[in-house]
Interface confidence: low
């Protein structure tokens, strides 16, 4: 299709190289509420069109995004072409940052229900370059946590090193929806709570002699509680005792409730005690069972081939630690009365002896 | 396509417990609150209360003193109790999911509900 | 706890009219609030979220704007399945609360 009678807007996205970030395009089609679609006669394609919140209603358009290519060649689908960059709904969702993503950006809508339609579009020149290094050390970062409950600000990363009066206008959005109670270079959040968590963009404009462009950031905010005061809670486990079979398998688990931290850090391991011989046990690794706002719930097994007396003997201990402290929970083996005939008991007493020359070949103090 | 079924007896006495549950086909119960709200004949709406699948609870003050919700992963079912009821509880009963929707941001909604059960506490 | 206030109680349109209800917080809740329909005997169904977004499969002709304590809710068209009662509700603090609600009737 022509793309000539597309609305143009010029993006600059100046990356840190210090960090992950993503950069977000929107279609900024105009409101179907003024008009089906754009009608080529109410936009000129001068004109920067009004921002349309696109939301999940089956009534508003889907729209088809293309990169054009330098040389001319035809425009590129870009679901096939490129595999970083995510297209959602409305949105342009570039996953990584990189001087190859410069390049001009088409969308328009998927269905085209009218010959004027045809020229409804908006072309997108993107350029993309690093941040100079000259840049402040302490600029804004992409991934912003804001805690909930108190008083917080949300940062525009281009332009966190100028003072709010230097700062020039800046466009915020959240979630694709134009926020208009600020055009300060930061957001103050008088109580946080968890709906102010998401994706935010903000845009201001920066001139030459020669053009103006559009300078965007894409902020990830977070809203996390504070961190945790407690050290954490073993679950599981509860009993210190657990009785077992000789000669079969068994998997004690251990679980573990680890407050938030923003620097997280768990520790969760099991360990042997035998008389006066203490060792930490390979064992599979941890894995997170439950992740909420407020903690997390981490697992990890301890596997026994087979039980022989001499673990009868043993206490097995899960240890877990976070920056507050540790928690321990021991456990006993017990066997269960009357649970095997003598074959079993000449089974255990085979297993213990070859277990018993494996141990002492390979485990001495733990310090 | 997720439904909430609920099941309780629609007469309880004054003094009495009221007991409903809600069981959730379709879905799982993981990663959601699941709510219960209630509308006394003719009125408004009134929440109740949540539980999350981890069981943690946050229920509405005016009612705290007499509300349980508890909730069973196993059998996909949560449940509501409350105690010492009187001609005032007289509703009908919802239970609802509470979802935290995620559009590159949360927002809570209310997204699935129950069929409703009509409770009258009578003697 | 939060108080909403609708307005009107109740109201008699026209298919094809456009209808306002308006909803306003005893203080500050940002965009956290949320329309539902609710139609005799049956549960409410969710129509507007955080304000101002659609929810999945729900008609155009309804909107949602406003931000901190007053809101409204607009169809734009009224359609015979429109009429119902519509209650707000906020999401910004617990417990969380509804208006009164505001019934739709025909004129």
């Known amino acids: 299709f022509n793309i000539s009678g597309c609305s143009t807007k010029k993006l600059l996205w100046a990356y840190s190289t210090r960090s992950e970030e993503e950069f977000i395009l929107f279609c900024d089609l105009p409101e179907p509420q003024k008009s089906h679609f754009c009608h080529r006669s109410q936009l000129s394609p001068t004109q920067v069109p009004d921002h349309l919140p696109f939301t999940d209603s089956k009534d508003l358009p889907d729209v088809q995004w293309y990169r054009q290519p330098s040389n001319g060649d035809p425009l590129e689908d870009i679901r096939k072409s490129y595999p970083h960059i995510i297209q959602d709904k409305c949105t342009l969702r570039f996953l990584t940052p990189g001087v190859n993503n410069t390049g001009s950006y088409i969308c328009r809508p998927k269905m085209i229900k009218s010959p004027y339609d045809v020229a409804c579009c908006v072309k997108m020149i993107l350029e993309v370059k690093p941040q100079s290094n000259a840049s402040c050390e302490n600029s804004a970062s992409h991934k912003q946590d804001l805690l909930l409950g108190s008083t917080g600000s949300i940062s525009c990363p281009s332009l966190s090193c100028q003072s709010d009066a230097q700062s020039p206008e800046v466009t915020w959005y959240k979630n694709g929806k134009l926020l208009s109670m600020t055009r300060s270079n930061r957001i103050v959040v008088d109580e946080v709570y968890i709906y102010h968590q998401g994706t935010y963009v903000c845009d201001y404009t920066q001139s030459d002699t020669a053009s103006s462009w559009t300078v965007r950031a894409v902020v990830q905010v977070r809203t996390i509680v504070g961190d945790t005061k407690l050290k954490p809670d073993i679950l599981d486990p509860v009993e210190s005792t657990l009785e077992v079979e000789l000669g079969k398998p068994l998997t004690i688990s251990c679980k573990a409730r680890f407050g938030f931290e923003r620097v997280f850090n768990p520790v969760m391991k099991w360990y042997i005690k035998d008389a006066d011989l203490e060792w930490e046990v390979s064992v599979p690794e941890a894995k997170s069972i439950k992740s909420t706002l407020k903690d997390e719930i981490i697992e990890r097994n301890i596997i026994l081939e087979k039980v022989t007396q001499r673990d009868l003997r043993r206490t097995f201990v899960c240890f877990v630690q976070n920056s507050i402290g540790n928690t321990t929970q021991s456990v006993q083996l017990k066997e269960k009365r009357g649970s095997g005939g003598l074959n079993d008991i000449f089974e255990a007493q085979k297993i213990e002896w070859h277990e018993t020359v494996r141990f002492q070949s390979h485990h001495h103090h733990h310090h | 396509q997720v439904q909430l079924q609920q099941s309780g007896p629609g007469l309880v006495k004054p003094s009495e417990t009221l007991s409903l549950t809600c069981t959730v086909s379709?879905?799982?119960?993981?990663?959601?609150?699941w709510t219960w709200i209630r509308q006394p004949p003719g009125k408004g709406l009134e929440w109740i209360g949540y539980?999350?699948?981890?069981?943690?609870?946050n229920y509405n003050p005016s009612l705290k003193s007499r509300v349980t919700i508890s909730v069973d992963t196993s059998k996909n079912q949560f449940s509501l109790k409350l105690s010492s009821v009187t001609a005032a509880d007289t509703a009908v009963y919802y239970c609802?999911?509470?979802?935290?929707?995620?559009?590159?941001?949360?927002?809570?909604?209310?997204?699935?509900w129950g069929q409703g059960t009509t409770v009258t506490v009578s003697s | 706890a939060i108080q909403l206030t609708q307005s009107p109680s109740s109201l008699s349109a026209s298919v094809g009219d456009r209808v306002t209800i308006t909803c306003r917080a005893s203080?500050?809740?940002?965009?956290?609030l949320a329309w539902y329909q609710q139609k005799p005997g049956k549960a409410p169904k969710l129509l507007i979220y955080d304000a101002s977004n659609w929810e999945s499969g729900v008609p155009s002709r309804f909107s949602g704007s406003g931000s901190g304590t007053d809101f409204t809710l607009t169809i734009s068209s009224l359609q015979p399945e429109d009429f119902a009662t519509y209650y707000c509700q906020q999401f910004n603090s617990y417990p969380w609360t509804f208006g009164q609600g505001t019934k739709v009737e025909i004129k």
């Open positions: 203080q500050g809740i940002s965009s956290a």
């Open positions: 379709g879905g799982s119960i993981s990663n959601y609150y």
């Open positions: 609802a999911r509470e979802t935290i929707v995620v559009r590159g941001f949360y927002f809570y909604v209310m997204d699935v």
């Open positions: 539980i999350s699948d981890s069981g943690s609870t």
